[in-house]
């Protein structure tokens, strides 16, 4: 149904291969990505309330598809912090500002704290962000690919149950 207004291949916005999305726009797409549909010559990405399309061979298109497939996009970001309210109720917001700033080896806070008992409430540094909601934004200076975790999709359980069940108290302390 390519070209159909109502079908899965209808495009709200078409991005030309000649002018790929900016880093900022890509991050916005990553954050709001809900689904994709492979059409004949292009791929349609369904976002929260709109859609965008790009050529099947465009690198940014392949990157976003990979991002959704591997559960690293969409609700993945909000999923990470969704449970901080009851995992770390006494903790201030967590900052992403220092992510990867000085060292190439990345051992996130949840790993540094992984030996703590589930009843303990570690206090993390006060961050520069004002709300949990803002934590859902990826680092806007980098483009990375790899998957998704949508609240109703693969690994929905990871977003909803795993902090308590699977990764202990540190599972969602997702930045240092």
């Amino acid at each position: 149904n390519e070209g159909s207004v109502t079908g899965s291949c209808y495009c709200g916005k078409r991005i030309s291969s000649d002018s790929p999305p900016s880093v900022q726009f890509m991050n916005r797409l990553r954050k709001h990505l809900r689904a994709y549909h492979r059409c004949l010559y292009y791929t349609r990405f369904q976002l929260l309330s709109w859609s965008v399309c790009g050529g099947n061979k465009d690198p940014w298109v392949q990157e976003l598809m990979s991002c959704l497939d591997l559960k690293e996009c969409g609700h993945a970001y909000s999923g990470i912090v969704a449970h901080q309210k009851h995992l770390l109720p006494t903790s201030p917001p967590i900052s992403q500002a220092s992510e990867g700033a000085s060292s190439d080896i990345h051992t996130p806070a949840q790993m540094l704290l992984s030996t703590l008992q589930s009843t303990q409430r570690p206090t993390l540094p006060v961050g520069s962000l004002s709300s949990d909601k803002e934590l859902t934004r990826p680092n806007e200076t980098t483009i990375h690919t790899a998957g998704h975790s949508l609240a109703a999709g693969p690994e929905a359980g990871e977003n909803q149950k795993q902090p308590e069940k699977n990764a202990g108290p540190t599972a969602r302390t997702s930045a240092t």
């Epitope: 689904a35 990979s66 591997l70 690293e72 969409g74 993945a76 990345h106 980098t142 997702s174």
Partner: antibody, heavy 118, light 113 residues
């Protein structure tokens, strides 16, 4: 060609520590979701741990059986992952496989054997 | 956790036969966001690491002979090996990667009759 090479396994006593490593090549490492899976002698496959990518702040997940004892980390600049295993138990004896989940499939290394015995 | 139930646990075959291994998940592995099933099939021979045969339930890994066919969707999946050869004797595992923790079937041991 995709390659995952584990190292660092060996014989340790209960309650001791061991750090195993995995060197990756042949794919875009920073985009891959990395996991450790183990297999006790003569048994089936058991997932151990997972680490996400940088946009998700390298969030980690652990099997209940290793939670609080194992620590998973990654170094994207070196295409390496590490599994720090503390307070080892005899039931941790297994072949430990490093796996890379990409959109082109799930790649496995040859494994490194960890034996915990008094 | 998603429970993966694999059957049969062992299978005795003769060369040239067609074999079917079943795998059932306790919840659907089909994601509506990309219409993909998060299921993989592996072959493991003694002393070797698992070898990926099929991913996304039906996509054959590069280099895997086309006699290995993955099918199914939702909760019911099948690995079909047509014209079994001696080198196919191994243990076969299904695995879901829809949710953390990843979980595996108990394995199907393919033996020579």
């Amino acid at each position: 060609a995709v390659q995952l090479v584990e190292s660092g396994g060996g014989l340790v006593q209960p309650k001791e520590s061991l750090k195993i490593s995995c060197a990756a090549s042949g794919f875009t490492f920073s985009n891959a979701v990395m996991n450790w899976v183990r297999q006790a002698p003569g048994k089936g496959l058991e997932w151990v741990a997972r680490i996400r990518t940088k946009p998700n702040n390298y969030a980690t997940f652990y099997a209940d059986s290793v939670k609080g004892r194992f620590t998973f980390s990654r170094d994207d600049s070196k295409s390496m992952v590490y599994l720090q295993m503390d307070n080892l138990k005899t039931e941790d004896t297994a072949m430990y496989y490093c796996t890379a989940w990409t959109t082109e499939g799930i790649y496995w290394g040859q494994g490194t054997l960890v034996t915990v015995s008094a | 956790d998603i429970v993966m139930t694999q059957s049969p646990s062992s299978l005795a075959v003769s060369a040239g036969e067609t074999v079917t291994i079943n795998c059932k998940s306790s919840q659907s592995l089909l994601y509506s966001g990309n219409q993909k099933n998060y299921l993989a099939w592996y072959q493991q021979k003694p002393g070797q690491s698992p070898k990926l045969l099929i991913y996304w339930a039906s996509t054959r890994q590069s280099g895997v002979p086309d006699r290995f066919i993955g099918s199914g969707s939702g909760t019911d999946f099948t690995l079909t090996i047509s014209s079994v050869q001696a080198e196919d004797l191994a243990i076969y595992y299904c695995q879901q990667y829809y949710d953390t923790p990843w979980t595996f079937g108990g394995g199907t041991k393919l033996e020579l009759k």
